[in-house]
């Protein structure tokens, strides 16, 4: 009778084991072990027992002890089970950004590992088990489908293998894959809203606003604003699930024409874009030309208005004849024209919009001086000792200086409150003088003495 000890062994791959072969007869003709494994016999006293060290056990094996006794030949097998953890535990690569609402398939691949009967594959979100299956096939593959939700944002998905050798008196061996961090996002199907001037004047600044609602996570959204080749640098304000990007755009003569304004929002691996056309135009204010801005009364004055070649002008509300970029009017300067404004209004159509520009010039008419009866009465009669204010207004442009003197030596205080005395009586020569000349007018002051009352 041949026996083997131990009859069953579980050992790590590449490990060694001592196997004892024994026989029941005292003098066996033959006692040995049959195995492809490297073996080494350990010397022991006696003939009916042999100990072998089997080394570098790479896979399951069944070494067989045999003996030849007088009563016949017999054999006994020992069962070596090799265990090892998987060489590769991996989640199939996925884009890190996933849109909310999408079905995400997680695939875990496991290479190696034994004994397979004790090997389980677990798919996890954080610490929560999503699926648990025995490892089948080489490589073993376990898949599960996850419906991506907003609250999955930032969650770590992983795959774990469990080699459970606790029933064999060993431990539970775990291997975990590198985690896959899920970034979830919501980019609405609606394009961003772009608010900007449809037309923009050369050498001015405009404001462009691009906004979008219903984004998640809004802080991760990238906004690109551009006018033609000019990248704009917006200031972005974030709400709970919205943003508003505001940028100033400056245009020069080189930008003149139709330009494309774009706003692109990039979130995750998706983007939404809005395009708009902006017409950049040059339209200087019309020019109002007076033959001379300052003229003397009676001078012929030509007022011209000139504007952009495609503009239509009106001068003081009167359209150009024929309708076009030039208008003019002729007038003979009168004192009433002093300070008169000549306003030229030019209208230009740009991309269906009417643009208006104005320019105003003022005419100065030099006239006078004037002294007349209405504003400088020739006769005053005042009671003696009364308070009176002599009034005499000279007209002209420039405003004349006025002096009223009696006998060239006694001034009459124009516009001042005076006490009427006999000294005040007499004839005064009032002189109004300006750069335009001098006029005189005689004013008589009569003083009524109390005794005549």
């Amino acid at each position: 009778q041949t026996s083997v000890s131990p009859s069953k062994v579980i050992l790590p791959r590449g490990g060694s084991v001592l196997v004892t072969c024994s026989t029941s007869c005292d003098q066996p003709k033959l006692l040995g072990i049959e195995t492809p494994l490297p073996k080494k016999e350990l010397l022991l006293p006696g003939n009916n027992r042999k100990v072998y060290e089997l080394s570098n056990v790479q896979e399951d094996s069944q070494p067989m002890c045999y003996s030849n006794c007088p009563d016949g030949q017999s054999t006994a097998k020992t069962f070596l089970t090799v265990y090892w953890t998987p060489e590769r535990v991996e989640l199939a690569p996925l884009p890190s950004w996933q849109p909310v609402g999408k079905n995400l398939t997680l695939r875990c691949q496991v290479e190696g590992g034994a004994p397979r009967a004790n090997l389980t594959v677990v798919l996890l979100r954080g610490e929560k088990e999503l699926k648990r299956e025995p490892a089948v096939g080489e490589p073993a593959e376990v898949t599960t489908t996850v419906l991506v939700r907003r609250d999955h944002h930032g969650a770590n998905f992983s795959c774990r293998t469990e080699l459970d050798l606790r029933p064999q008196g060993l431990e539970l061996f775990e291997n975990t894959s590198a985690p896959y961090q899920l970034q979830t996002f919501v980019l609405p199907a609606t394009p961003p809203q772009l608010v900007s001037p449809r037309v923009l004047e050369v050498d001015t600044q405009g404001t462009v606003v691009c906004s979008l609602d219903g984004l998640f996570p809004v802080s991760e959204a990238q906004v690109h604003l551009a006018l033609g080749d000019q990248r704009l640098n917006p200031t972005v304000t974030y709400g709970n699930d919205s943003f508003s990007a505001k940028a100033s755009v400056s245009v020069t003569a080189e930008d003149e024409g139709t330009q494309r304004l774009t706003c692109a929002v990039i979130l995750g691996n998706q983007s939404q874009e809005t395009l708009q056309t902006v017409t950049i135009y040059s339209f200087p204010a019309p020019n109002v030309i007076l033959t001379k801005p300052e003229v003397s009364e009676g001078t012929e004055v030509t007022v011209k208005c000139e504007a952009h070649p495609r503009a239509k002008v009106t001068l003081n509300g009167v359209p150009a004849q024929p309708l076009g970029p030039r208008a003019q009017l002729l007038l003979k300067a009168t004192p009433e024209d002093n300070g008169r404004s000549f306003s030229c209004s030019a209208t230009l159509e740009v991309a269906g919009q009417l643009i208006h520009k104005n320019q105003t010039r003022e005419l100065r008419v030099l006239y006078g001086p004037r002294l007349d009866e209405r504003d400088c009465p020739g006769n005053w009669t005042w009671p003696e000792n009364s308070q009176q204010t002599p009034m005499c207004q000279a007209w002209g442009n420039p405003l004349p200086e006025l002096k009223c003197l009696k006998d060239g030596t006694f001034p009459l205080p124009i516009g001042e409150s005076v006490t009427v005395t006999r000294d005040l009586e007499g004839t005064y020569l009032c002189r109004a003088r300006s750069t335009q000349g001098e006029v005189t007018r005689k004013v008589t002051v009569n003083v009524l003495s109390p005794r005549y009352e």
Epitope: D407, G408, D423, L429
Partner: antibody
Framework: VEESGGGLVKPGGTLTLTCTVS????????MGWVRQAPGKGLEYIGI?????RTYYASWAKGRFTISKTSTTVDLKITSPTTEDTATYFC??????????????WGPGTLVTVSS | AYDMTQTPASVEVAVGGTVTIKCQAS??????LSWYQQKPGQRPKFLIY???KVASGVPSRFKGSGSGTEFTLTISAVQSDDAATYYC????????????FGGGTEVMVK
């Protein structure tokens, strides 16, 4: 406007200073006489108006007489004393004041009263 | 009578400084006041008329103000050429020419 007739005069005598004008008419301008004793301030003697009416300082009445022709204005000093030693100025329009064109001063003529 | 009183009688001022001369009339002369500048051996030079109007050719550093009985001549950013005697004159009553001029203010520039 230019003064003449100044010089050395004996106390108690008579002296007439003449102011000759050109470029304007005395019928439309008043003329005044102002004097300044050595190291002292300015003082008005009197004024003749465009109508020939005269106005004098109270201290000058009786001893000073202002008169005019079409182109001259005279200042007659009777019985001068050493106190009357001064530079005498003729002034156009002393009371008119459009600008300096109306305030014309002559260069002055020096009168020295000494025995 | 319209007597004119001028203060101070003399004043010393540094180049670049400001000097203020006051003139008081014994009764209202409205704005009929003139200012003159006189340098030794020269005739008076007309500076200001109607209390505040600057005569042509006079630098804007000279400024007149006041009306009624109180008047002021201010010379700002004084220059050495401003050393002279300054007189005020009432130009209102020709029938009262006694003391029509102020006593004068000598301005010395250091």
């Amino acid at each position: 406007v230019e003064e003449s007739g100044g010089g050395l005069v004996k106390p108690g005598g008579t002296l007439t200073l003449t102011c000759t004008v050109s470029g304007f008419s005395l019928s439309t301008h008043a003329m005044g006489w102002v004097r300044q004793a050595p190291g002292k301030g300015l003082e008005y003697i009197g004024i003749i108006g465009s109508s020939d009416r005269t106005y004098y300082a109270s201290w000058a009445k009786g001893r000073f007489t202002i008169s005019k022709t079409s182109t001259t204005v005279d200042l007659k000093i009777t019985s001068p004393t050493t106190e009357d030693t001064a530079t005498y100025f003729c002034v156009r329009d002393p009371y008119d004041s459009f600008d300096d064109g109306y305030r014309l001063w002559g260069p002055g003529t020096l009168v020295t009263v000494s025995s | 009578a319209y007597d004119m009183t001028q203060t101070p009688a003399s004043v010393e001022v540094a180049v670049g400084g400001t000097v203020t001369i006051k003139c008081q009339a014994s009764q209202s002369i409205y704005s009929y006041l003139s200012w003159y500048q006189q340098k030794p051996g020269q005739r008076p030079k007309f500076l200001i008329y109607d209390a505040s109007k600057v005569a042509s050719g006079v630098p804007s550093r000279f400024k007149g103000s006041g009306s009624g009985t109180e008047f002021t001549l201010t010379i700002s950013a004084v220059q050495s050429d401003d050393a002279a005697t300054y007189y005020c004159q009432q130009a209102y009553s020709s029938s009262n020419v006694d003391n029509a001029f102020g006593g004068g203010t000598e301005v010395m520039v250091k």
